[in-house]
Interface confidence: low
Amino acid sequence: RRGAPAEDQDCGRLPDFIAKLTNNTHQHVFDDLSGSVSLSWVGDSTGVILVLTTFQVPLVIVSFGQSKLYRSEDYGKNFKDITNLINNTFIRTEFGMAIGPENSGKVILTAEVSGGSRGGRVFRSSDFAKNFVQTDLPFHPLTQMMYSPQNSDYLLALSTENGLWVSKNFGEKWEEIHKAVCLAKWGPNNIIFFTTHVNGSCKADLGALELWRTSDLGKTFKTIGVKIYSFGLGGRFLFASVMADKDTTRRIHVSTDQGDTWSMAQLPSVGQEQFYSILAANEDMVFMHVDEPGDTGFGTIFTSDDRGIVYSKSLDRHLYTTTGGETDFTNVTSLRGVYITSTLSEDNSIQSMITFDQGGRWEHLRKPENSKCDATAKNKNECSLHIHASYSISQKLNVPMAPLSEPNAVGIVIAHGSVGDAISVMVPDVYISDDGGYSWAKMLEGPHYYTILDSGGIIVAIEHSNRPINVIKFSTDEGQCWQSYVFTQEPIYFTGLASEPGARSMNISIWGFTESFITRQWVSYTVDFKDILERNCEEDDYTTWLAHSTDPGDYKDGCILGYKEQFLRLRKSSVCQNGRDYVVAKQPSVCPCSLEDFLCDFGYFRPENASECVEQPELKGHELEFCLYGKEEHLTTNGYRKIPGDKCQGGMNPAREVKDLKKKCTSNFLNPTKQNSKSNS
């Protein structure tokens, strides 16, 4: 039974773990006095880490800075000072280290240059930071270099003078392909989308920008939208918020063909002080937040159909503070269809909500077993778990980390939380779910940093404390039992845990510094758990697990979005290595269709607590404002449309008379009168 966690009790204490870990703990002391450290992993499964330390002394007129660059190729066990490879140059930390996609081995560091120089300077490596080439730029970069996802030799950057610069040879040579550019993004197939201002500046022309596209790295251009406020890419959708003709409101328009044709999204328009935000998007659908009028701090989540056009209201009073502000919206990547977020209730308290079906229905998080409701609860026996995420962190609550889940650690979600009627400002505890958020248990008392290793085979945690620490905790049974390991005799001021992205590694690096009266020294301890998980997992170590199972007796048990998935999961009792090549084994099976597998199409809605879609009464005999492609085609519907990503077959097929909606269609989206095609000579 999953109760409160046990630490070093009769909990299957691992034999000789202290000796095994001591032999696999590697200390590295950094011989510099830097004020900040940034760390980047280069490539996947390469073991290469770059560490940039910076030391800045602000003087009256200029600031004097010094950078040091270190490289490890054994997951952080040993580091080599490679500052000489960048000519001891001061690196601008605000640009970070631009690491190339996948395993390209490419790295770009942007250097600080003196005031009068013609352009910026970068150091480029294409061999996992073994060597760097210094390149002087013909412009001063405003943003970090952006790699094309399809070809890491193709780079784009904006200059401080709003020029759009492109390189086709990994930054060796650069060409300015357009001026007056406000925002630029890579799309699919090396397409670049960007907005330009026509009259004054990006800020002054907000709402009067043009959206352009180039498919050939700047040889030719096409204007694909006008009166643009902003644009974004999500999944296979291109979104633009477009100013209305009549007033200062704006509306979202959607394209699924890179801007050749647009449709107006069936979403409320927003005023000047409001905003739209794409919370999440995949190849099937999008979660869109629409801000409420006024400075409320909340809005509404809508989920789209497969075209990104028809939207269903998903969640009211969704917490989202301001444009670019804080939202707790979290995609639980360890289980399909699961998202967690926060709502702001009438009394201004914040409550966590979870959806298991991609936004179809939201509910409170189940109260962890054996937990007591805190002071926020009216009824001491009935309450729920509330998760601390970005908003709590921004409010400086004692929450060192956001919720954590990993696609290859199936079902595991770790988060800080409190148990009551709303999020509490009291010191939180750490909770874990092993089933994607259906059930929860307290994992650790008080705030901790945590990370997942070996695809869930090991969970590592470090207590969040303002005192120096020297203990790391780890669990090999998904957080039920914990062992403590003293990784150093000299406690350090802890600054962060670092493990290779993807949670496949068995190494964890503990970063911090030691401080004496005069000096501060950076230090890292890398602990390798390979000897704790001595053997490779075998077939017997895994057990099948039906995801989303809530009623094993029901033939539709586990059906989410038209199919169920059985996973092979490591038994909690098995202490073995999943290994770096571990692939999540899952067996999907299709479910029969029911009305739950369909959303309501244009002009239809579901009355409260009903499953059938009925025609919207206000549209009977009226014109439809929302139109596909702004034209009169494809406007027939039977009122239902399959939910994006739903794979159900057979069963219930909502058949009814097909209505012709062409007669009701009006769209006022102004596509550019003639979609200009231009050549860049």
């Epitope: 189940r366 995801a547 094993p552 033939y555 009792s573």
Partner: antibody
């Protein structure tokens, strides 16, 4: 309702093989493992092995390795246990038992702990010359 | 393999008595322990899983406790239908071994 129905009693000569069947009904066959347990006359229970009907993978107790084969037929929701090279000490009642280690139960408390919750009526196998 | 040792191997008790049976594992098995009841000529019946969780339909006079290596099955007030043999079984790692059994007889 959920039930497991086993084949009838068998009398075999030493050295022969026996194949016992266990037909499942009332639940999703591929969602639960199936264990086989035997009980010699006047003795205790002895676990022989387990099969995952979904993929057909098996795990046998060392004692029976090389002599036991567990298979399944998903079209008829039936699992089989075949024991070869029979000797007199194999005389026992053989049980199949549904083993929910292969499924997440509804409540969090039971999600990873489980027992063999449904048993067949048993098949008596007598080995005698 | 993990050895499961049950004690006593048999006991005599009267209706209404409180009965305790213990089971010890040769190594820690966390809470992966089940208890079964078997009556002559019948298949075993699951009583307790996960050391302390009562299987649905089992009377509440049966309870289980323990974790690690030492476990206990308690019948708070023995009823006539409770006279049977009781087995513990570990479900921690294969092979899923059983204890030798405890026969509860009428005094």
């Amino acid at each position: 309702q959920v039930q497991l129905v086993q084949s009838g009693a068998e009398v075999k000569k030493p050295g022969a093989s026996v194949k016992v069947s266990c037909k499942a009904s009332g639940y999703t066959f591929t969602s639960y493992y199936m264990s086989w347990v035997r009980q010699a006359p006047g003795q205790g229970l002895e676990w022989m092995g387990i099969i995952n009907p979904s993929g057909g993978s098996t795990s046998y107790a060392q004692k029976f390795q090389g002599r036991v084969t567990m298979t399944r037929d998903t079209s008829t929701s039936t699992v089989y246990m075949e024991l070869s090279s029979l000797r007199s000490e194999d005389t026992a009642v053989y049980y199949c038992a549904r083993d929910p280690s292969g499924i997440a139960a509804a409540g969090p408390a039971s999600r990873y702990y489980y027992g063999m919750d449904v048993w067949g009526q048993g098949t008596t196998v007598t080995v005698s010359s | 393999d993990i050895q499961m040792t049950q004690s006593p191997s048999s006991l005599s008790a009267s209706v209404g008595d409180r009965v305790t049976i213990t089971c010890r594992a040769s190594q820690s098995i966390s809470s992966y322990l089940n208890w079964y009841q078997q009556k002559p000529g019948k298949a075993p019946k699951l009583l307790i899983y996960g050391a302390s969780s009562l299987q649905s339909g089992v009377p509440s006079r049966f309870s289980g406790s323990g974790s690690g290596t030492d476990f206990t099955l308690t019948i708070s007030s023995l009823q006539p239908e409770d006279f049977a043999t009781y087995y513990c079984q570990q479900h921690y790692v294969g092979p899923f071994t059983f204890g030798g059994g405890t026969k509860v007889e009428i005094k």
